[in-house]
């Protein structure tokens, strides 16, 4: 009978049928099984024996189907680099980290390695909302019409101008991108030194 068609099996063109779960072993010129996530190769394959896999020890992992002879060491999220943990390491997955609140990823090598503080957005602007928090530095955009933001902050949002009439008041001074509308009691005149404040 011809050599079998389940791993280990002969491969003349150095490719295997299931690229995810098999690999070409060049010394024996055969296709062998990879080890599933959470395991590693404890005995290499040959023409007479398929790969033998063993479970990763505690505090180690392998994320993919592999033919590694060791598991990768779990690494904590480094707070000095501005990272925090969102999911612990398991035998099948490395520790999941993200940038701490108020920070963004400044260095990326397959994953974030270093976070920095988000830049402040000046009064009259706010940080443009991103698909993924912590992915990039703030891009400040002006408050849209009818809104204001009066601090230098990385996270403050533009708020709608107060509508004086909703509070039974009248407008003393219109709102700007950097300040709210100033309202006054309809019966009281606004003293000059109280300009830019709300009087009840």
């Amino acid at each position: 009978s011809q050599p079998q068609a389940v791993p280990p099996y002969a491969s003349e063109n150095q490719t295997c049928r299931d690229q995810e779960k098999e690999y070409y072993e060049p010394q024996h010129r055969i296709c062998c099984s990879r080890c599933p996530p959470g395991t590693y190769v404890s005995a290499k394959c040959s023409r007479i024996r398929d790969t033998v896999c063993a479970t990763c020890a505690e505090n180690s992992y392998n994320e993919h189907w592999n033919y590694l002879t060791i598991c990768q060491l779990c690494r904590p999220c480094d707070p000095v680099m501005g990272l925090e943990e969102i999911a612990p390491c398991t035998s099948k997955r490395k520790t999941q980290c993200r940038c701490q609140p108020g920070m963004f990823c400044a260095a990326w090598a397959l994953e974030c390695t270093h976070c920095e503080l988000l830049s402040d957005c000046p009064p009259g602007t706010e940080a443009e909302l991103k698909d993924e928090v912590g992915k990039g530095n703030n891009h400040c955009v002006p408050c849209k019409a009818g809104h204001f933001q009066n601090t230098s902050s990385p996270s403050a949002r533009c708020q709608p101008h107060t509508r004086c009439e909703n509070q039974g008041l009248v407008e003393a001074a219109p709102g700007t991108a950097q300040s709210d509308t100033t309202c006054k009691n309809p019966l009281e005149p606004l003293p000059p030194e109280m300009s830019g404040t709300m009087l009840m």
Epitope: Q2, P3, A10, E12, P26, Q27, R29, R47, I48, R49
Partner: antibody
Amino acid sequence: EVQLVESGGGLVKPGGSLRLSCAASGFTFSDYYMYWFRQTPGKGLEWVATISDGGSYTYYPDSVKGRFTISRDNAKNSLYLQMSSLRAEDTAMYYCVREENGNFYYFDYWGQGTTVTVSS
Amino acid sequence: DIKMTQSPSSLSASVGDRVTITCKAGQDIKSYLSWYQQKPWKAPKILIYYATRLADGVPSRFSGSGSGQDYTLTISSLQPEDFATYYCLQHGESPWTFGGGTKLEIK
């Protein structure tokens, strides 16, 4: 006709070096894995080294690992074995061998051999 | 390493005799076994591969059998040119290992 012709054997002192060559003809050399085997009266036949068809992969038994290096030049249809830190136990007849390139992995052609003697 | 135990180490026989040489592997080698003939001062020559298959140009009086750990080379009717040394080789798992050889001599 497939031919494998070894050369480069000789007498060398312990600790010395020697380079064996094998000239291949009569087949598409670059399609085949090539091997060196050796034969001694004491230990019989022994595998020494393997090189893949393109030369990317090389393999050795523990007995020669770190001392012997197999290489090939597909443009010249030539196989080589660089031997260093030679020991008395490396004294043997060295054969250049072709592994068939189908699914059965046997050694279908052997050269006539070249003799290596390691002695002071 | 897989140990290959070949027996007998030597054998005397006559032309026309039926001769059997055996090789026992230290573990199941799944038929990755070949047999070689070697004459004095010559290179080994392939006879049988994958335990039972006759190599090109080899006379049909040579045959191979066996599976698992146990393998046999049979010469059905010895010819004068068959007096030589015979080796088995396992190539199922690196490092490839040979039997110690069987020297077949004229009785």
